[in-house]
């Protein structure tokens, strides 16, 4: 009896479901009562699942396996393995007995994508050319072990003085830490690339060091190239799409949205069903559009903490993923202006003008200018403080010596929204009180 399995390993993402394909050619008049089907681990011979005496005997493998009962009669002896774990990796043998006997082994290769690497420097301040610096590149929760590559700004590989360690957690997923020791030149860019050899997925980050200053990063899945900008408190749509084939069925679809860096699950659609939000119940898919290839995610009541990269994983017959960035923004309020002192002002007095604008995001750019539009850059101190929601209050202080009269304007710019909020104060030359009395 000829039993057919794929030659290549079946690659499955941790936490998703995998199908170990196995088929045989039923003869005319074949009946399930004739079938003995056994799935077992090739090496240990541990029973995984079986079908005998015309009945599915069920899973012997942590209740995470299932056959395709409606397809058995057509010769489809495939095994569905749910919620794949690293420990599942290995060879599974499919034994089929009807009149004759046949078997074949299929390999399961488990994989998990690595997060975008984070980069740290030691020391990270007062750097000068000639200093030796240690750059650490860390990427998390991937499998199997990663390949790590370093290169400079010109793409030249850096192989000397690299130490890489990989540690598996309880789930068998690896955290990789790679350390590069370099002697700084006048300036330099250092890139770390963490490659998942199974997924052929590259995660990379780079750091540019300018000494004497603190360093300051198979299914075609389509997402917007530009970040999605969303106002705090509004709803955002993270667009993701794929091209369904004729006859595409939602039962074939595995869709996973997760945070790119931490791999935290955000939302999923598997086994023909919306599995719901795993992200504070603030996410939703567009169920009526999934069959047309629209895998977009709706994120409700956006918060500052939502900012970052979200990855859309789509698995049908093949697998594909793409990441979309969410840029959160909040407009700054119209600045309020205060003077200190604010009465009996005379030409020649030094006055402190404070410009305050509230509850914006991200951090603002603040500009001062006089009545003629000439920038005022000296004696300006600006502070920005985030509240519990991550929104910034900005306070900018200008110290000036009063002339005969003068107008002082403060402009608070939100760099993402390209929104300018401005306030101004006019101080006349004669003795005066601020605000002017009616």
């Amino acid at each position: 009896l000829e039993v057919q399995v794929p030659e290549d390993p079946v690659v499955a993402l941790v936490g998703t479901d995998a199908t170990l394909c196995c088929s045989f050619s039923p003869e005319p008049g074949f009946s399930l009562a004739q079938l003995n089907l056994i799935w077992q681990l090739t090496d240990t011979k541990q029973l995984v699942h079986s079908f005998a005496e015309g009945q599915d005997q069920g899973s012997a493998y942590a209740n995470r396996t299932a056959l395709f009962p409606d397809l058995l009669a057509q010769g489809n002896a495939s095994l569905r393995l749910q919620r794949v774990r690293v420990a599942d990796e290995g060879s599974f043998t499919c034994f089929v007995s009807i009149r004759d006997f046949g078997s074949a082994a299929v390999s399961l290769q488990v994989a998990a994508p690595y997060s975008k690497p984070s980069m740290t420097l030691e020391p990270n301040k007062d750097l000068r050319p000639g200093d030796t610096v240690t750059i650490t590149c860390s990427s998390y929760q991937g499998y199997p072990e990663a390949e790590v590559f370093w290169q400079d700004g010109q793409g030249v590989p850096l192989t000397g003085n690299v130490t890489t360690s990989q540690m598996a957690n309880e789930q068998g997923l690896f955290d990789v830490h790679s350390i590069l020791r370099v002697v700084l030149g006048a300036n330099g860019t250092y890139s770390c690339l963490v490659r998942n050899p199974v997924l052929q997925q590259d995660a990379h980050s780079s750091v540019t060091i300018t000494p004497q200053r603190s360093p300051t990063g198979a299914v075609e899945v389509q997402v917007p190239e530009d970040p999605v900008v969303a106002l705090v408190g509004t709803d955002a749509t993270l667009r993701c799409s794929f091209s369904p084939e004729p006859g595409f069925s939602l039962a074939q679809l595995n869709l996973i949205w997760q945070l790119t860096d931490t791999k935290q699950l955000v939302h999923s659609f598997t086994e023909g069903r919306d599995q719901g939000s795993a992200y504070a119940n603030r996410t939703a898919l567009f169920p009526d559009l999934l069959a047309q290839g629209n895998a977009s995610l709706r994120l409700q009541r956006v918060r500052v903490a939502d900012e970052g990269s979200f990855t859309c994983f789509v698995s049908i017959r093949d697998f594909g993923s793409a990441a979309v960035s969410l840029q959160v923004a909040a407009p700054y309020s119209k600045p309020s202006m205060t003077l200190e002192p604010n009465k009996d002002l005379r030409p020649g007095d030094t006055v402190t003008i404070t410009c305050s604008s509230y509850r914006g995001y991200p951090e603002a750019e603040v500009f001062w200018q006089d009545g003629q539009g000439v920038p005022l850059t000296g004696n300006v101190t600006t502070s920005q403080m985030a509240n519990e929601q991550g929104l910034f209050d900005v306070h900018s202080v200008l110290r000036v010596v009063l002339g005969a009269n003068g107008t002082y304007s403060c402009l608070v710019r939100n760099p993402v929204l390209q929104q300018d909020a401005h306030g101004s104060v006019t101080i006349t030359g004669q003795p005066m009180t601020f605000p002017p009395e009616a």
Partner: antibody, heavy 119, light 109 residues
């Protein structure tokens, strides 16, 4: 052998709703395959209208999406094409056909039923 | 919506070879268009021949084959027989739906 048979009213008035039935014998519509509606206008032009797959997933021709729905009765082995409002331009011969998932051919066709929309 | 174009009519002799093509208004036809070929004989008898560019439906004679030729999908009838005298429609998949061509009348005489 698999057989598909289309049935419908034959003559309807404009703006009326309409339901056509495709009865499948010899195969379970929940086992596999995707089940299509296709129509042929006078003059021979064919138009693919949509399908319902074995698990109930629908896909429709965008030009018809808001006017039709495809549903099924699994216990009777039937699937249906429903129009919410017909026009004279819906006069055509309507066919159902089985599509093979992964190979994408239409391997079995119903014999078709002629629908005339006229006041 | 995309427009799919076929030759209106082709003629061949018994035993001859005829190639029908299917062009897309949106550009080159690729395997992602899952080209489909359907035969219609008198009395509206339809038979599916080819799906997914080149997958022959069960029971379809091997003289029918599907392929991509240049930027078009093609149906080749090699060793045509008189019973192949029929109308042939191609359909191309555009992400969520099929669009049929106008059909090619093949005469075998």
């Amino acid at each position: 052998d698999v057989q598909l048979q289309v049935s419908g009213p034959g003559l309807v008035k404009p703006s009326q709703s309409l339901s056509l039935t495709c009865s499948v014998a010899g195969y379970s519509i929940t086992s596999d395959y995707y089940w299509n509606w296709i129509r042929q206008f006078p003059g021979n032009k064919l138009e693919w209208m949509g399908y319902i797959s074995y698990d109930g997933t629908n896909n429709y021709n965008p030009s018809l999406k808001n006017r039709i729905s495809i549903t099924r009765d699994t216990s009777k082995g039937q699937f249906f094409l429903k129009f919410n409002s017909v026009t004279t331009e819906d006069t055509a011969t309507y066919y159902c056909a089985r599509g093979k998932d992964g190979s994408y051919y239409f391997d079995y066709w119903g014999q078709g039923t002629t629908l005339t929309v006229s006041s | 919506q995309a427009v799919v174009t076929q030759e209106s009519a082709l003629t061949t002799s018994p035993g001859g070879t005829v190639i029908l093509t299917c062009r897309s208004s949106t550009g080159a036809v690729t395997t992602s268009n899952y080209a489909n070929w359907v035969q219609e004989k008198p009395d509206h008898l339809f038979t599916g021949l080819i799906g997914g560019t080149s997958n022959r439906a069960p029971g379809v004679p091997v003289r029918f084959s599907g392929s991509l030729i240049g930027d078009k999908a093609a149906l080749t009838i090699t060793g045509a027989q008189t019973e192949d005298d029929a109308m042939y429609f191609c359909a191309l998949w555009y992400r969520t739906h099929y669009v049929f061509g106008g059909g090619t009348m093949v005469t075998v005489l």
